[in-house]
Structures are given as structure tokens and as C-alpha cells.
């Protein structure tokens, strides 16, 4: 039985040429995390990280995803076009699949404010 | 340049184990995993599992848990793989493989090192 | 385990030809997908990685294509050298799996 939650940062918002922290939390559960996948909104994998291989980043965003910090993802050098869903998909023994998703809205404007609260989506 | 040199071929018989050695040279050894990909006589790749030489710590395919061991000696920059209780379908070449930096792709091997289990 | 289903086993073809080998994978793994070729006797050497990227120094001739579930790798002008076995291999999720391999002859 899946008793875990998946906690994020859930919708947030940074400013073009900037970096933002996607990170997900998995909580009431005892399983082990074996791999989190980061995807993006058109399923396109930015990342992979094993729990023993470490990270795994895809070429299409080397030079501007950063691993962690934690499970967690760095996207760095923002432009309009990374304004969408963010999904973590967590891989667990002996629960199974978790997924947590995050909306990530790149502003134009300077006083953009990077939300870092945590919620269940 | 990067090398991965394996140790030689080997015959055993049902129910032994084997280690195989795989040295390296020309890269930070600590910072790639290593991984251990098999190969029957004219037959398909297997993916046995990997090891992080930084942590030691390691995934294995399911299909051998139990039965396999992956280790490394960070002072001669050397990974092991140790398979027990060997049958004749282990009679395959064992190939190691390192990981491209942050990618989960083989970019070099060792030359492979034959089993052979016979009775 | 996600199965990779590799056709066809092997194909002959001739100097110059177009060659085109599918893989098939049993779930959705993204781009997470790399080609290998082989040749007799030795370690396999990567040619494409990330479904579509060609590894340093692999020539033009060889590409990559496809998402999801299915996969595919073209020699757009086959060479002599290219005779070996080619294999494609997921890395979605552990384990990670090959396909059955492809053999590439001369005609």
C-alpha cells in the first residue's frame, strides 16, 4: 500500500536569465528511493538520479540544469520558453511510483519573486 | 589516455565463484561508476549492475542479487566483480564499462575476460 | 524489466545502402536510449546517445531518432567497417536492458 506524499514547491515564479530550485520531498513512507526522474511538461527528461549511479543530465540541458541540491534540480539561465509543468517521479521499493508536479513561471519583470514554500499537489 | 584493463580468462567448475578484475588508468577513478555488462558466445549485452567507487555503494540487476559482488580498491584504481555458486550459463565474457561524467552512458570498456564453467 | 526488442537480427545490404534498425521498447522511456555497435572480438564503442546525439568522433552517417517507445538507428551510406552488431540499450530505470542486437552484413 502507497502511504507516501509527495510534498513540492508547487507553483512558482523566477526572472528571465536567472535560476530557480525545483525540489520535491516524499514523506510518510518508509521506502527506499531507488531513482528520481525530472521531467519536463512535453516529457522531455531533463535529469535522472540514482540513488547509488547519482545524476544522470540530459544533453539538451547540460549546460543549464545543475544537480541538487538533494534530490532537488537546478534550472539555470530562465527564458520564457521554461514557463510550464515540472514533474519528479519518484521510484520507491517496495511502494511504487510517486509523482509531484511543480508550475514554473518565467517573468519578464525584475520583481519576480522566487517561491520556496512547500505543498501537497 | 583511458584504459581499462581486465584481468585473463578463467575456467571453473559448477559452484565455484570467480572475481575478475578491471584496473583503470587515465581518468579520476573515483568520480565515474563502473559498471559490469555480460555477453554468452554469439548472444545478446546484459546489464549485471554498477558501483560507485566514491561510496561503494551499488545497484544490482535482480537477476543476479545474491550472486554478485561488485567492489572496488581505490588505491590501485581497480573495480571487481565476484560472481558465486557459478552454472554453465555463466559461460559468457565479462565486460566492465565506466560511465560518461553525469551521463548513463558506456564511453569506454575493458577487452572483456572469458569464463568458462565446466565440470 | 523493460524489454527492448531490437529488428531486425540481421540484415545484409550493400556498400552505399541505407540501412535502418528499429528498437522497440516495452514501456515509455523518454529519450533514454543509446546505440552500440560491436564487432567481432571486441568491446562494444558508443555511437549514439540520448535517442538522437552522436558520441565524440562517430560519423555523420550514423543517426538516431525516436521517443517513447520506439526507436530508430540509420546508416544513411553503408561502409565496409560498418559490418558488426549494433544494440540498443535503455537506461530509464534499473535494470537496465539491450536489445537482442542487430547484424549488419555486406552483400
Known amino acids: 500500500m502507497m502511504t507516501g506524499t509527495i510534498e513540492t514547491t508547487g507553483n512558482i515564479s523566477a526572472k528571465k536569465g536567472g535560476s530557480v530550485i525545483l525540489q520535491c520531498h516524499l514523506s510518510s513512507t518508509m521506502a527506499q528511493v531507488t531513482q528520481v526522474n525530472w521531467e519536463q511538461h512535453d516529457h522531455s527528461l531533463l535529469a535522472i538520479r540514482n540513488a547509488e549511479l547519482g545524476w544522470h543530465i540530459y544533453p539538451a540541458f547540460k549546460d543549464r540544469v545543475a544537480p541538487g541540491p538533494g534530490l532537488g534540480l537546478t534550472l539555470q539561465s530562465l527564458t520564457m520558453n521554461d514557463t510550464g509543468e515540472y514533474f519528479c517521479t519518484y521510484h520507491t521499493y517496495p511502494d511504487g511510483t510517486y509523482r509531484g508536479r511543480i508550475f514554473l513561471e518565467v517573468l519578464e519583470s525584475s520583481v519576480a519573486e522566487h517561491s520556496a514554500r512547500f505543498q501537497i499537489p | 589516455q583511458v584504459q581499462l584493463v581486465q584481468s585473463g580468462a578463467e575456467v571453473k567448475k559448477p559452484g565455484a565463484s570467480v572475481k575478475v578484475s578491471c584496473k583503470t588508468s587515465g581518468y579520476a577513478f573515483t568520480e565515474y561508476t563502473m559498471h559490469w555488462v555480460r555477453q554468452a558466445p554469439g548472444k545478446g549485452l546484459e546489464w549485471m549492475g554498477g558501483i560507485n567507487p566514491n561510496t561503494g555503494g551499488t545497484t544490482y540487476n535482480q537477476k543476479f542479487q545474491g550472486r554478485v559482488t561488485l567492489t572496488v580498491d581505490k588505491s590501485s584504481s581497480t573495480a571487481y566483480m565476484e560472481l558465486s555458486s557459478l552454472r554453465s550459463e555463466d559461460t559468457v565474457v565479462y565486460y566492465c564499462?565506466?560511465?560518461?561524467?553525469?551521463?548513463?552512458?558506456?564511453?569506454?570498456w575493458g577487452q572483456g575476460t572469458l569464463v568458462t564453467v565446466s565440470s | 524489466d523493460i524489454q527492448m526488442t531490437q529488428s531486425p537480427s540481421s540484415l545484409s545490404a550493400s556498400v552505399g545502402d541505407r540501412v535502418t534498425i528499429t528498437c522497440q521498447a516495452s514501456q515509455d522511456v523518454r529519450t533514454a536510449v543509446a546505440w552500440y555497435q560491436q564487432k567481432p572480438g571486441k568491446a562494444p564503442k558508443l555511437l549514439i546517445y540520448?535517442?538522437?546525439y552522436r558520441y565524440t568522433g562517430v560519423p555523420s552517417r550514423f543517426s538516431g531518432s525516436g521517443s517513447g517507445t520506439d526507436f530508430t538507428f540509420t546508416i544513411s551510406s553503408l561502409q565496409p567497417e560498418d559490418i558488426a552488431t549494433y544494440y540498443c540499450h535503455q537506461h530509464y530505470i534499473t535494470p537496465w536492458t539491450f536489445g537482442g542486437g542487430t547484424k549488419v552484413e555486406i552483400k
Open positions: 564499462a565506466k560511465l560518461l561524467r553525469l551521463m548513463y552512458y558506456f564511453d569506454y
Open positions: 540520448s535517442a538522437s
